[in-house]
Interface confidence: medium
């Protein structure tokens, strides 16, 4: 067959292509951030000739548009400025209520570079209606202005734009509205990945539950489903895998379906797994049905077996027939475990379609949902148990009314969106699921997304100031008990002048605790050894401190999770019978073990544990230092086998106010604290003011830098007698 | 004061060896990282490799890698350079660079020639 | 290896007049909250002198018309009104990791 012509160039932007110049290849352009390609793709038909979908003639040059942003068509109550046809990238709209009605929302946006106004619709209230009036987003129209019970509202877009969101809302007992707030947007516009990942996240995690289910709280961030850890979630993940997907996109899509499999499993639900691949058929590579959609290992590597060329001889996309199969799935699941049966009832169920564009056979995907919804008995009262979270990648050829279609319609939530590329994916799925807003006690979990703050990222992490000391670190370790280092308390008794600063969604300085009590080593002296010619030795360099008030669990106070309980063993998804040696084994593993202390500034900073022979090399360094250690003859008589070693090569080194602070590790999506930060033998922050600054040791300097943490493997005994009944430790 | 002196002029045929000394007055010779740096005529600045005096431990260019050797004789605070299977685009300044605390070359050696003409 | 390429190779500059020099690094050379490139003058015939160490600090006893910028790989020295002893070549050289290297060099004549 001959191939297509090769002058497609657009000029300020790029193009790429599915298969090459032969036919069937889907070109697709791109253009720069607040720029948009018309038009947006091309097809290599047969005959050799190009074909530009919905264009009359078959090749128009094709060039990079501004992107604008859609004006407001109306506005109840107030009035907004400028008033324009649509708005340049960077355009700003203001608005205004009229006297004795409140302003919700955001009072001025700002248009962003992918075609969307940035904050929140703003909405200007009197709070008259049973319901608050549910606003009318910026390009839509609404119809209905009465919002008593059961009253609906409906809402339209001007020609050319897309809604998505609820078309028809209706008034609800309790004061809100059904489905999700509508938009109405442009074809070319899409989501960023910052926006998704949160919305994605905050819908999916509060579906992941670890929530507690006794706590009922009125959250802006949308529903909390209370999945108690014993409830069970199966997740349907379809992977489009039509022509139009090339091989390499399929192959992000297989990672990113890999990335949040392996999150999910992080969770302390029950949870099974089912992969479907589609085009014109689906094809079912692990049903929930089967025991192994509940090992990770075992849904990660059928995802990795899933091959593009399953589905070369099919080449369409039938969105229906793959939904129709996560049906036969349910049917069988439900049939299996009996229809009235607690255990069929209480299955949360969760969709997500990767797709790259419209269906285009096998029947309305609406249908199969539709049956989905009936088998599930989706009603009101149990809208909870099914979420489908339709995303398609590739900004220009998507259908957003068919995604928006299949994606659930949930007060405060989005189910539906459409991302620029694969790329754009990837990092989503990074950064979805965010179990940080959980309130109870999960422990070792931090935010992980580009945009959290520190204190998002270690919720754990305290600052102690006692008196008239510089300031110490330390961690959570449960909502009320601190781990520190005892060095910082070696002047005075008198806690009653300490504080304990501890991360708070409210304030960007936390909020200060007072101590209840604290519980100092007896082994810690650090004189003990001085005759030795050691003039400062730092065995049983541990402390807790026990917190006046228990603290809220938030996005940015929640504990670590400390190795030997229970808690950690959940979070390392390790069997029952498990032991603290077998902690030990999984989390220092090798004879270099990445791991993290916070600096002074709040950020995360890198270290190497070394261990075995590693370790020996890393400590024997410390016979040079003839300050501290005058006559030194045996390091281990300074570095005894409590202390863990870093400071080699790249490793970051902890400053004298860090010391204290959790030596942590990630597993799983997950932090455990393995050390504390001890002693040390060059302090970057020496002569420095300035929190961000530190200055790494010169090469030649003599000794190297190295640094020493309390081995918590190594302080069980001490650390059960004080948190027996606060932990749940595993054997030894 | 610090002083980095280094030694004299050297005329070397093709394949042969030339070893450059410096001699390191005014601070603690085991402290501070010796850096060797090379330039030919009109042309910029090559650093060679790098030697610790105190654990003797050798950082090299990968360019150098087999050819240059760095060595240190503590007791005399000097510090050496040996370039073997000398070629003529080795004719050059050989300079040693004493780091400061920032690891920048805060002290030069005054620079020693060497030619490798046959 | 860290390649720096310096900007321009030579330039001509009136006395009392402002000159700027860069030095863009393919790689970051930032750690632990420092930029570890520094600037070196050398006259003919002479050793290369230290002017600015950690990208922005002035060396002891260098007059302060010399002054450094930048951040991970985009460096600037700028020397505010130039003297006649200012004519040299100009060189930046990284040491956030071996091998360390240098820039190209710059020549700044006199006008």
């Known amino acids: 067959a001959p191939s297509c012509p090769q002058n497609v160039n657009i000029s300020g932007g790029t193009f790429t292509l599915s298969h090459g110049w032969a036919p069937g290849s889907l070109l697709t352009y791109s253009c720069p951030q607040g720029l948009y390609p018309s038009p947006a793709s091309r097809l290599c038909k047969s005959s050799g000739q190009w074909q530009t979908p919905g264009a009359t003639r078959s090749l128009s040059k094709a060039v990079c548009k501004p992107v604008r942003c859609p004006a407001p068509v109306s506005f109840e109550n107030g009035i907004y400025t400028p008033r324009l046809g649509s708005y340049p990238v960077g355009g700003n709209v203001s608005f205004e209520c009229e006297d004795g009605f409140i302003l919700r929302g955001s009072p001025v946006r700002q248009c962003r570079p992918n075609g969307m106004w940035d904050g929140e619709t703003a909405v200007c209230d009197n709070g008259a209606g049973y319901c608050s009036n549910p606003g009318i987003p910026i390009g839509t129209r609404k119809v209905g202005s009465q919002y008593r019970l059961e009253d609906s509202v409906t809402y339209h877009c001007s020609r050319g734009l897309t809604l998505r969101g609820s078309q028809r809302r209706t008034c609800q007992e309790g004061g809100s509205w059904s489905g999700t707030e509508p938009s109405c947007q442009d074809p070319y516009s899409y989501d960023f990945p910052e926006d998704v990942a949160p919305a994605l996240g905050t819908s999916f995690s509060h579906m992941l539950g670890a929530t507690n289910p006794t706590q009922k709280t009125k959250e802006s961030l949308g529903r909390k489903i209370q999945i108690q850890r014993s409830g069970h979630l199966n997740l349907y993940l379809l992977l489009d895998c039509s022509q139009s997907v090339s091989e390499n996109d399929f192959l992000i899509f297989k990672e990113s379906a890999s990335l949040m499999v392996d999150r999910i499993f992080s969770f302390e639900i029950n949870v099974s797994v089912a992969i479907i691949t589609f085009a014109s058929e689906p094809k079912v590579l692990m049903s929930v049905l089967n025991d192994n959609s509940r090992d990770m290992t075992e849904v990660i590597s059928s995802l990795e077996n899933a091959n593009y060329k399953d589905h070369e001889n099919g080449t369409g996309t039938n969105t229906y027939a793959a939904l129709n199969s996560v049906y036969l799935m349910m049917n069988n699941q439900m049939r299996l475990l009996g229809m009235e049966t607690m255990a069929w009832q209480e299955i949360r169920h969760a969709i997500i379609l990767l797709t790259d564009g419209k269906s285009n056979m096998g029947g309305s995907p609406k249908t199969a949902v539709d049956h989905i919804r009936e088998i599930l008995n989706i009603n009101q009262k149990r809208n909870d148990y099914l979420d489908i979270y339709a995303i398609g990648v590739g900004k220009l050829d998507v259908d957003w009314r068919e995604l928006n279609e299949l994606g659930s319609k949930k007060d405060g939530e989005r189910h539906a969106f459409i991302l620029q590329d694969t790329k754009a994916l990837h990092q989503v799925f990074e950064h979805m699921l965010d179990v940080s807003k959980l309130t109870d006690t999960i422990c070792g979990v931090g935010n992980m997304s580009a945009n959290a703050s520190d204190q998002e990222r270690t919720p754990w992490h305290v600052t102690i100031k006692p008196k008239s000391q510089e300031t110490c670190r330390g961690a959570l370790i449960s909502d009320q008990w601190v781990l520190t280092a005892a060095h910082c308390f070696r002047d005075g008794n008198d806690h009653s002048l300490w504080r304990v600063n501890v991360g708070d969604p409210k304030s960007q300085w936390g909020k200060e605790f007072l101590i209840e009590k604290a519980v100092i080593s007896p082994g810690f002296d650090v004189f003990a050894k001085k005759n030795q010619g050691i003039l400062e030795f730092y065995g049983d360099d541990i402390a807790l401190l026990k917190l006046a008030q228990k603290v809220k669990m938030s996005t940015h106070a929640r504990p670590i999770c400390l190795p030997c309980t229970m808690e950690a063993n959940l979070a390392l998804r390790r069997p029952q019978g498990s032991t603290c040696r077998d902690h030990e084994n999984e989390l220092l593993n090798k004879q270099s073990v990445p791991a993290h202390f916070v600096a002074l500034n709040g950020s995360k900073l890198n270290i190497n544990l070394k261990m075995g022979v590693e370790w020996t090399s890393c400590a024997e360094v410390v016979s040079q230092e003839k300050t501290m250690f005058p006559n030194l003859t045996d390091v281990r008589e300074v570095v005894t086998d409590q202390f863990l070693c870093s400071g080699t090569q790249e490793d970051e080194s902890p400053c004298k106010g860090e010391s204290g602070g959790a030596v942590f590790l990630e597993r799983r999506f997950r932090f455990f604290q393995v050390g504390l930060v001890s002693w040390g033998l060059y302090n970057p922050c020496l002569g420095s003011a300035d929190k961000n600054s530190r200055k790494r040791a010169p090469r030649s300097k003599v000794p190297p830098p190295r640094d020493f943490h309390i081995n918590l493997f190594r302080m069980q005994p001490w650390l059960r007698q004080h948190l027996g009944d606060v932990l749940n430790f595993l054997p030894l | 004061e610090v002083q980095l002196v280094q030694s004299g002029a050297e005329v070397k045929k093709p394949g042969a060896s030339v070893k450059v000394s410096c001699k390191a007055s005014?601070?603690?010779?085991?402290?501070?990282?010796m850096d060797w740096v090379r330039q030919a005529t009109g042309q910029g600045l090559e650093w060679i490799g790098d030697?610790?005096?105190?654990?003797?431990?050798?950082g090299y260019n990968q360019k150098f890698k087999g050819r240059a050797t760095m060595t240190v004789n503590k007791s005399i605070s000097t510090a050496y350079m040996e370039l073997s299977s000398l070629r003529s685009e080795d004719t050059a300044v050989y300079y040693c660079?004493?780091?400061?605390?920032?690891?920048?070359?805060?002290?030069w050696g005054q620079g020693t020639l060497v030619t490798v003409s046959s | 290896d860290n390649v720096l390429t310096q900007s321009p190779d030579s330039l001509a500059v009136s006395l009392g007049e402002r000159a700027t020099i860069s030095c863009r690094a393919s790689?970051?050379?930032?750690?632990?909250?420092?930029?570890?490139m520094h600037w070196y003058q050398q006259k003919p015939g002479q050793p290369p002198k230290l002017l600015i160490y950690?990208?922005?600090n002035l060396k002891s006893g260098v007059p302060d018309r010399f002054s450094g910028s930048g951040s991970g790989t985009d460096f600037t020295l700028t020397i505010s009104s130039l003297q006649a002893e200012d004519a040299a070549t100009y060189y930046c050289?990284?040491?956030?990791?071996?091998?360390?290297?240098f820039g190209q060099g710059t020549k700044l004549e006199i006008k």
């Open positions: 005014g601070y603690t010779f085991t402290d501070y990282n």
């Open positions: 950690l990208a922005s």
């Open positions: 790689k970051s050379v930032r750690t632990s909250g420092y930029n570890y």
């Open positions: 660079a004493r780091e400061d605390d920032h690891d920048a070359f805060a002290y």
């Open positions: 050289q990284h040491s956030r990791e071996l091998p360390y290297t």
């Open positions: 030697i610790n005096p105190n654990y003797e431990s050798t």
